[in-house]
Amino acid sequence: VPLSRTVRCTCISISNQPVNPRSLEKLEIIPASQFCPRVEIIATMKKKGEKRCLNPESKAIKNLLKAVSKERSKRSP
């Protein structure tokens, strides 16, 4: 991974584009920290394992987060 100690936040760009929950392998929500003062959302896609930084402020992404948490709560007993 092209990381150096000076890189503070993971996302160079963020995407507003809606993501189909079915095409998601994983969704990571990285809370703000001393290294990066903003929340970062990283989606790992099933196709080729592509990772995409998502815009936490986007309506489409907020809807995605709701859909994913709904799906998780369905699965958990």
Epitope: P2, C11, S15, C53
Partner: antibody, heavy 124, light 109 residues
């Protein structure tokens, strides 16, 4: 459509300064990292600098560190390159380029939108 | 620092022929970080391939990318007249920096 327009190039004497601008339209500028890439006459492409979408990180090629500063004003949809202590070897076409949607340190989507470039000539 | 080498320097082919362009890295590069660009005289570069093998938006399917580790390839299955240009590979590396190869010129035989 997505567009980037560079300005501010010109002829300048060695040791002097110049500020390049790049104005974006057709996309949400504040969502994308931005780059400056240059091309000396008859030569290949050389990456110069990058700035994260929110300005959180900035990085430079070694040859311009301490002389050039990349910055952005998201309220004006504009990217800048402040060039100080210019040298003859800085003579080039300077392009601004958009970092692809969703790029991060774990996956790189390439520079997907480019301006037409502005020419900087350093010489006496 | 990773150095990219492209070969051949110039490729002379006829329209309709297959073009195979090579990009070699001095150290292993994750395929997630490799891109290819096309540049025609007097024009800005254009992104063709990212992630070593994914075509950028609007790029015809005659362009394909492959490879991993230190060896990457851009293939143009059947050259069209508009494909004669210079092609650059590029990698995103640590620090982070974004390095371009020296380019391969594809010209008409």
């Amino acid at each position: 459509q997505m567009q980037l327009v560079e300005s501010g190039g010109g002829v300048v004497q060695p040791g002097r300064s110049l500020r390049l601008s790049c104005t974006a339209s057709g996309f949400t500028f504040s969502n994308n990292g931005m780059h400056w890439v240059r091309q000396a006459p008859g030569k290949g492409l050389e990456w110069v600098a990058v700035i994260w979408f929110d300005g959180m990180n900035k990085f430079y090629v070694d040859s311009v560190k301490g002389r050039f500063t990349i910055s952005r004003d998201n309220s004006k949809n504009t990217l800048y390159l402040e060039m100080n202590s210019l040298r003859a070897e800085d003579t080039a076409i300077y392009y601004c380029a958009r970092e692809g949607d969703g790029s991060g340190i774990y996956y790189y989507y390439g520079m997907d939108v480019w301006g037409q470039g502005t020419t900087v000539t350093v010489g006496s | 620092e990773i150095v990219l080498t492209q070969s051949p320097g110039t490729l002379s082919l006829s329209p309709g022929e297959r073009a195979t362009l090579s990009c070699r890295a001095s150290q292993s590069v994750s395929s997630s970080y490799l891109a290819w660009y096309q540049q025609k005289p007097g024009q800005a570069p254009r992104l063709l391939i990212y992630g070593a093998s994914s075509r950028a938006t609007g790029i015809p399917d005659r362009f394909s990318g492959s490879g991993s580790g230190t060896d990457f390839t851009l293939t143009i299955s059947r050259l069209e007249p508009e494909d004669f240009a210079v092609y650059y590979c590029q990698q995103y590396g640590s620090s982070p920096i974004f390095t371009f190869g020296p380019g391969t010129k594809v010209d008409i035989k």
